[in-house]
């Protein structure tokens, strides 16, 4: 297993609709034809997998059916979008990239993106 540098933004603020997007960029030492991207969430020293996708030559990442993630790829950049976020989901979201093929296998883990989620204020009651 060889190490690889992965860069991602330090901070992202989710939209009022609970959507956060960020770019995960990896320094590929060669031309990988099969890449696996995993988003991990670290909160209170616990790490959980948010979503993962293996992609090849296309520009759209395909996630499992119940995933809250969507994404596209362009060169060595992966544009990730996480949906359905609420205030309790605030935390550090880490991008992990694996170059699955061809050998050798490379692994890179970013420093994480702190995603802040603020639940929208409920609309005040109307007289109408």
């Amino acid at each position: 297993c060889k190490a690889m540098h992965v860069a991602q933004p330090a901070v992202v603020l989710a939209s009022s609709r609970g959507i956060a997007s960020f770019v995960c960029e990896y320094a590929s030492p060669g031309k990988a034809t099969e890449v696996r991207v995993t988003v991990l969430r670290q909160a209170d020293s616990q790490v959980t997998e948010v979503c993962a996708a293996t992609y090849m030559m296309g520009n759209e990442l395909t996630f499992l059916d119940d995933s809250i993630c969507t994404g596209t790829s362009s060169g060595n950049q992966v544009n990730l979008t996480i949906q359905g976020l609420r205030a309790m989901d605030t935390g550090l979201y880490i991008c992990k990239v694996e170059l699955m093929y061809p050998p050798p296998y490379y692994l890179g883990i970013g420093n994480g993106t702190q995603i802040y989620v603020i639940d929208p204020e409920p609309c005040p009651d109307s007289d109408f």
Partner: antibody
Framework: QVQLVQSGAEVKKPGASVKVSCKAS?????SYWINWVKQAPGQGLEW???????????YYNEMFTGRVTMTRDTSTSTAYMELSSLRSEDTAVYYC????????WDQGTMVTVSS | DIQLTQSPSFLSASVGDRVTITCSAS?????IHWYQQKPGKAPKLLIY???TLASGVPPRFSGSGSGPEFSLTISSLQPEDFATYYC?????????FGGGTKLEIK
């Protein structure tokens, strides 16, 4: 030029298994997914699953999980789809298609399940 | 699973007509891809990533849309366009196809 060539038609009894091959040429086999698609007579298209020929990573449609196995042989640039416990509803044309965009298809393999 | 609903299921039209087929997803998807299939033949990629024409596809075909609603338009039908058309999504597994739209000569 890019070509996918599948094995010939098969007639099987209920409960049996069938293994269909898909030989690729004209491109780097390990750079594109190989997808398998089912089309029953007079019906639409149903994605069965896919395999990444390099690592062998597979994704299956849950409708077929437990009955379908996708493998590959990189030395011959051939992908295989094996379907077990065959029943009459499995009578269909099975296609292999290349990549994320399903940009190249073979003409398909007719599998008939009949007692 | 993401369901793709195509409408209409059947469409009768004449050579020279402009026709539009719609594809509605049960959940928002990033892109839609379109295929054409003629009887006894394998499907053929027409449009990928919602609006990009596949190699060799004539410009009378166009695709558009976003989120859950997408469409395929043929600006001026030619005799060779009478076929069945399928939309497909690959935002999430399992990849799914629409039920198809059979385009027939009026």
């Amino acid at each position: 030029q890019v070509q996918l060539v599948q094995s010939g038609a098969e007639v099987k009894k209920p409960g049996a298994s069938v293994k269909v091959s898909c030989k690729a040429s004209g491109y780097t086999f390990t750079s594109y997914w190989i997808n398998w698609v089912k089309q029953a007579p007079g019906q639409g298209l149903e994605w069965m699953g896919r395999i990444a020929p390099g690592s062998g990573t597979t994704y299956y449609n849950e409708m077929f999980t437990g009955r379908v196995t996708m493998t590959r042989d990189t030395s011959t640039s051939t992908a295989y789809m094996e379907l077990s416990s065959l029943r009459s509803e499995d009578t269909a044309v099975y296609y292999c298609a290349r990549g994320d965009y399903f940009d190249y298809w073979d003409q398909g393999t007719m599998v008939t399940v009949s007692s | 699973d993401i369901q793709l609903t195509q409408s209409p299921s059947f469409l009768s039209a004449s050579v020279g007509d402009r026709v539009t087929i719609t594809c509605s997803a049960s959940k928002s998807v990033s892109y839609i891809h379109w295929y054409q299939q003629k009887p006894g033949k394998a499907p053929k990629l027409l449009i990928y990533d919602t609006s990009t024409l596949a190699s060799g596809v004539p410009p009378r075909f166009s695709g558009s849309g976003s989120g859950p609603e997408f469409s395929l338009t043929i600006s001026s039908l030619q005799p060779e366009d009478f076929a069945t058309y399928y939309c497909q999504q690959r935002t999430t597994y399992p990849l799914t196809f629409g039920g198809g739209t059979k385009l027939e000569i009026k």
